[in-house]
Interface confidence: medium
């Protein structure tokens, strides 16, 4: 059996090497000569030659100092054979212990360390946390057991200690009140790392500690009184610039100014912010009315875009508007009127009075009034009154100029203003209709076959209105009834069938067609007949002598 | 203050005649123009006509035919005269005051209820 | 004459919530001459004669509060009520008074759930 006690050694050890560990030694021995060796990582394996046996004693001895950072543990076996090189013993399993000096100091992950806190923060919030390492034996020795501590703060304002950090964590937290980013916005601290709890090898890092923004100070307007003008009835007219200041950090929410006008009901005046400088632009949202207000005396306050982190009070300005005369257009009331006069309203007579309204209630103005469009040249008006007269006859059925019984003219109200200012009203005529149209065929040219004929459709027209128009009642006259009949087409009596009685000649006819309409407003219309050398339905005729009273007379 | 308040017989028989005054306090119908409205039981407003500071009147088109309003501007009342009333007549009639300043009517009576019924 | 079209002709909300109406005319009524939109908006709330609310399209009438909102130009128009309340059951009317004769749209009843 082998008797083998357990095998430590320090690191770092001073010479003289080989130094001895310990005897290992075999129950065999007694029984005659046993002869020792070792194998292993530091024997016969890389690194080699760290530890020897001697071969006869049994004294294992280690070569060269340690390092447990690089081989905490070795792991040999130790071998025994007689003098005739047979094996005595099993092999055994050696452990040799490297034991710990603080020969590391603790490093930290970084040099720099970067963390930030919100000003204002109270005293216990977290801000970052430092990290060292320690390459000792932190399970069995206090070598690597590392205490973090604080050594300086850059600035010591407003209190020297406004940082603490956790002895075993490092974790850095607030300690004191008074961060303020706008006093100073960044500190550095020196932070320590020693171990054997502190009171051993040390290292430094920096950790800077950025105090971040918030919303502590508000937009202030300087100057707090404006003064502006704007002519009147024009929107979106920038009137003046608000100026504010704001500590808080620039281009972020809490510098960003928000104003906001405190008496505009109507909703007339709109504050926009200029993103690049923050200033306040006063603008019109909706044309002002001089003649309604001529001064606007506005209250406009100023907060940020986030709401105030703490209590603070609303800058506010005074911006005293005011609104410029300026000649406005004449108006006509109502903008568009409708008035309805028969077609055979008499000339020269007065339709309507269509007058305008000077909004420039503080100019004594006077209005001239113009027909500036009258396409069939029938009104006339009075400059001064506005009243508006025809002067040519009016006609409903004169569709070039009434579109569906309307006439439209437009009139112009001219003031004596400085410029002149002009408005436009807008007169629809509803022309009521009378019955001044008789009915009339179309067509009035038609083609018959001299075989066979055809019978023709002749439509009536009358551009009168109902009950001036159908149903109509169509008689043949001057003879014309001898050769030819006309028959209604359709229960309304707005179309007629014309054919001839027997056959006719080729050649040309005339054919008188009295038409009558509703009112018995009648009409004789000559009707151009051609009767052509075909069979069935009319080609192309050829011309022949016209026939009077749908009888051919020979030329 | 602004006041305008009608009176109106309440019922009518069909084919008879209407009349509503409207008597105004406040202001004057000299300066003021006054407007006719009604509204059926249930239903939306219809405008019926104007009368002008001048005296000058227009009228709904499709009621023109059987309606005259005029006033008398020392009395402060406007009158409205509608013939040949029909069931579909029956309604509340308002007068109301344009503004002078955006033609939009900015007061408006209470109302007199008409009932068109034999 | 000019034709008033509104719609819905009527909606349900619940107190807070934003409301909008629509009304349509059948011509402009945009006056070049003064480029104001001649239209009022009314609302009449049950058993009481109509109130003005705005004019000229999107003016509020002194008194009205500034939850009430009017825009549009030419043909198209719309009231906006940004948060409801209560009290603002009714029945809202827009009315043209570009020419004769100043018609009125059919109204939009608006009621809370």
């Known amino acids: 059996d082998w008797v083998i006690p357990p095998i430590s050694c320090p690191e770092n050890e001073k010479g003289p090497f080989p130094k001895n560990l310990v005897q290992i030694k075999s129950n065999k021995d007694k029984e005659g000569k046993v002869f020792y060796s070792i194998t292993g990582q530091g024997a016969d394996t890389p690194p080699v030659g760290v530890f020897i046996i001697e071969r006869e004693t049994g004294w294992l001895k280690v070569t060269e100092p340690l390092d447990r950072e690089r081989i905490a543990t070795y792991t040999l076996f130790s071998h025994a054979v007689s003098s005739n090189g047979n094996a005595v013993e099993d092999p055994m399993e050696i452990l040799i212990t490297v034991t710990d000096q603080n020969d590391n100091k603790p490093e930290f992950t970084q040099e720099v360390f970067k963390g930030s806190v919100m000003e204002g923060a109270l005293p216990g919030t977290s801000v970052m946390e430092v990290t060292a390492t320690d390459a000792d034996d932190d399970v069995n020795t206090y070598n690597a057991a590392i205490a973090y501590t604080i050594l300086s703060q850059d600035p010591e304002l407003p209190d020297k200690n406004m940082f603490t950090i956790n002895r075993n964590t490092g974790v850095i937290s607030v300690v004191t009140t008074g961060l303020d980013r706008e006093s100073f916005p960044t500190y550095t601290l020196v932070v320590q790392a020693a171990d054997l709890q502190g009171e051993g090898l040390s290292t430094t890092a920096t950790a800077v500690i950025t105090v971040t923004d918030t919303n502590d100070n508000p937009p202030i307007f300087n100057p707090t009184t404006y003064k502006g003008q704007v002519p009147e009835n024009e929107a979106n007219v920038v009137i003046t610039t608000l100026k504010v200041t704001d500590a808080d950090a620039p281009n972020t929410p809490a510098w960003e100014a928000v104003y906001t006008i405190l008496n505009d009901d109507g909703g007339q005046f709109v504050v926009t912010t200029n993103p690049v400088n923050n200033d306040g632009i006063l603008k019109t949202a909706k044309g002002l009315d001089f003649e309604a207000k001529q001064q606007y005396i506005l209250h406009v306050a100023v907060t940020n875009v986030v709401p105030f982190e703490v209590s603070l009070t609303t800058s506010t300005a005074t911006v005293t508007v005011d609104v410029l005369d300026v000649n406005e257009a004449p108006i006509f009331v109502p903008p568009e009127k409708r008035v309805e006069v028969s077609e055979d309203f008499g000339v020269g007579q007065e339709i309507t009075s269509y007058t305008a309204q000077e909004p420039d209630t503080f100019m004594e103005q006077k209005i001239t009034y113009r027909i500036w469009r009258d396409t069939a040249n029938w009104l006339e008006i009075n400059p001064d009154t506005g009243a508006i007269s025809t002067r040519a006859e009016l006609d409903r059925e004169d569709f070039e100029h009434v579109k569906n019984s309307t006439y439209t003219a437009l009139i112009i109200a001219t003031d004596n203003g400085s410029p002149v200012a002009t408005g436009t009203g807008t007169l629809l005529l509803i022309l009521s209709d009378v019955n001044d149209n008789a009915p009339i065929p179309e067509p009035r040219t038609i083609f018959f076959c001299e075989r066979n004929p055809k019978p023709q459709v002749i439509n009536i027209i009358d551009a009168d209105l109902p009950p001036n128009t159908s149903p109509f009642t169509a008689e043949l006259t001057h003879g014309a009834s001898a050769n030819w009949t006309i028959q209604y087409n359709d229960p309304t009596q707005e179309s007629i069938i014309l054919k001839p009685k027997m056959a006719l000649e080729v050649g040309d006819y005339k054919i008188n067609l009295k038409l009558m309409d509703n009112q018995n407003k009648d009409q004789v219309t000559t009707l151009e007949v051609s009767v052509c050398d075909c069979e069935g339905a009319a080609g192309v005729c050829r011309k022949a002598q016209p026939v009077e009273a749908g009888l051919q007379i020979p030329a | 203050q602004v006041q305008l308040k009608e009176s109106g017989p309440g019922l009518v028989a069909p084919s008879q005649s209407l009349s509503i005054t409207c008597t105004v306090s406040?202001?004057?119908?000299?300066?003021?123009?006054i407007s006719w409205v009604r509204q059926p039981p249930g239903k939306g407003l219809e405008w019926l006509g104007i009368?002008?500071?001048?005296?000058?009147?227009n009228y709904n088109s499709a009621l023109k035919s059987r309606l005259s309003i005029s006033k008398d501007n020392s009395k402060s009342q406007v009158f409205l005269k509608m013939n040949s009333l029909q069931t579909d007549d029956t309604a509340r009639y308002y007068c109301?005051?344009?503004?002078?300043?955006?033609?939009?009517?900015?007061?408006w009576g209470q109302g007199t209820s008409v009932t068109v019924s034999s | 004459d000019i034709v008033m079209t509104q719609s819905p002709s009527s909606l349900a909300v619940s107190v807070g919530e934003k409301v909008t109406m629509s009304c349509k005319s059948s011509q402009s009524l945009l006056y070049s001459s003064n480029q104001k939109n001649y239209l009022a908006w009314y609302q009449q709330k049950p058993g009481q004669s109509p109130k003005l609310l705005i004019y000229w399209a999107s003016t509020r009438e002194s008194g009205v509060p500034d939850r009430f909102t009017g825009s549009g130009s030419g043909t198209d128009f719309t009231l906006t009520i940004s948060s409801v309340k209560a009290e603002d059951l009714a029945v809202y009317y827009c009315q043209q008074y570009y020419n004769y004769p100043y018609t009125f749209g059919g109204g939009t009843k608006l009621e809370i759930k």
């Open positions: 406040g202001f004057s119908l000299t300066s003021y123009t």
């Open positions: 009368i002008w500071t001048a005296g000058a009147t």
């Open positions: 109301a005051r344009y503004s002078k300043d955006y033609y939009a009517v900015d007061y």
